[in-house]
């Protein structure tokens, strides 16, 4: 995880610490680098990256995705709605990142780094969103049963699930990064 700097708060309300944006930006780019490394191993190990049968596995997944209504795109941008969506989406991705932990051989540490860095990113963003409405956290029981269900899939579906999680998480972070740069 890239080291965070001491925040430099200024007195007036809503005035942001001068270093908070840099920390968020660097954190997302660090996670994206980690995802690239994991995708490399996944694509080298199987042909999932070229597969056209993604829809079969996608039926089992409810991966967070940016939509127009979330306010994170240039068209219809809404910074507060968008920030809530980013944090909610990252919290929802946590169970999928937990699933990834036993899915890599040579990149085991990288998978752990992506998971831990995402937790840190969530903390940074929650600090930025401190004046916004409460953000709903996924239900731990639902997450536990989802994890069990994913781990019980056959090998092909597990490989496809891994590929889809990484691809979706990458797309989600890229959209988040673009939006957060305006905030």
């Amino acid at each position: 995880v890239p080291p965070g700097e001491d925040s430099k708060d200024v007195a007036a309300p809503h005035r942001q610490p001068l270093t908070s944006s840099e920390r968020i930006d660097k954190q997302i780019r660090y996670i994206l680098d980690g995802i690239s490394a994991l995708r490399k191993e996944t694509c080298n190990k199987s042909n999932m990256c070229e597969s056209s049968k993604e829809a079969l596995a996608e039926n089992n997944l409810n991966l967070p995705k940016m939509a127009e209504k979330d306010g994170c795109f240039q068209s219809g941008f809404n910074e507060e709605t968008c920030l809530v969506k980013i944090i909610t989406g990252l919290l929802e991705f946590e169970v999928y990142l937990e699933y990834l932990q036993n899915r890599f051989e040579s990149s085991e540490e990288q998978a752990r780094a992506v998971q831990m860095s995402t937790k840190v990113l969530i903390q940074f963003l929650q600090k930025k969103a401190k004046n916004l409405d409460a953000i709903t956290t996924p239900d731990p029981t639902t997450n536990a049963s989802l994890l069990t269900k994913l781990q019980a899939q056959n090998q092909w579906l597990q490989d496809m699930t891994t590929h889809l999680i990484l691809r979706s998480f990458k797309e989600f972070l890229q959209s988040s990064l673009r939006a957060l740069r305006q905030m």
Epitope: A12, R15, Q16, E22, D25, E80, R178, R181, Q182
Partner: antibody
Framework: EVQLVESGGGLVQPGGSLRLSCAAS????????MHWVRQAPGKGLEWVAK????????YYSDTVTDRFTFSLDTSKSTAYLQMNSLRAEDTAVYYC????????????WGQGTLVTVSS | DIQLTQSPSSLSASVGDRVTITCSAS?????MYWYQQKPGKAPKLLIY???NLASGVPSRFSGSGSGTDFTLTISSLQPEDFATYYC?????????FGQGTKVEIK
């Protein structure tokens, strides 16, 4: 045509106040963060402040913190810089600039408005 | 704050010359930008994120570098390129600018 037009500059005494306006046209104002950058006569560029598209977050340089306030009126596609406790060293041409969507680059700039602080 | 030092501060060149301006940062920066400014005018974005050409900017302009050392190159100087060039960085707020490099006609 995409453009930003600044107004409100002029001569003001030290300790005085001034409000600059930046009117946007030719593009949808709502998704873009806005900035103020200034340039003292014969000198280089100095970043002053940023405001997020909906005005929820603002950032200021140390030289103007607690004296300047950046605000928006999205219904008028206009950004404002309220400058209080002005000093001689605030004398400069003030430019407003739009932040490129998805990047930190400042891609569209106004023509600038001159603020002179002198007794 | 991150300091940016441009070199040279000024240079004289002829139309058709290859011109190189460097920008050195006091510490490693996340993003680097280059601007062109003509007397009495607002700055104009040339290069963003180290090496991406801004919309409408001729391909004779290019940017390179990473970490602390960055370069703006004009492959073949044109009459309209005589101006002052500024590097600008973002690595969190505040944005900072170099002191400028004035490109004059020889």
């Amino acid at each position: 045509e995409v453009q930003l037009v600044e107004s409100g500059g002029g001569l003001v005494q030290p300790g005085g106040s001034l409000r600059l306006s930046c009117a946007a046209s030719g593009f949808t104002f709502s998704p873009f963060a806005m900035h103020w950058v200034r340039q003292a006569p014969g000198k280089g560029l100095e970043w002053v402040a940023k405001i997020s598209p909906g005005g929820s977050w603002t950032y200021y340089s140390d030289t103007v913190t607690d004296r300047f306030t950046f605000s928006l009126d999205t219904s008028k596609s206009t950004a404002y810089l309220q400058m209080n406790s002005l000093r001689a060293e605030d004398t400069a041409v003030y430019y407003c600039a739009r932040q490129k969507w998805g990047y930190y680059a400042l891609d569209i700039w106004g023509q600038g408005t001159l603020v002179t602080v002198s007794s | 704050d991150i300091q940016l030092t441009q070199s040279p501060s000024s240079l004289s060149a002829s139309v058709g010359d290859r011109v190189t301006i460097t920008c050195s940062a006091s510490i490693s920066v996340s993003y680097m930008y280059w601007y062109q400014q003509k007397p009495g005018k607002a700055p104009k974005l040339l290069i963003y994120d180290m090496s991406n050409l801004a919309s409408g900017v001729p391909s004779r302009f290019s940017g390179s570098g990473s970490g602390t050392d960055f370069t703006l190159t004009i492959s073949s100087l044109q009459p309209e390129d005589f101006a002052t060039y500024y590097c600008m960085q973002w690595s969190g707020y505040p944005y900072t600018f170099g002191q400028g490099t004035k490109v004059e006609i020889k």
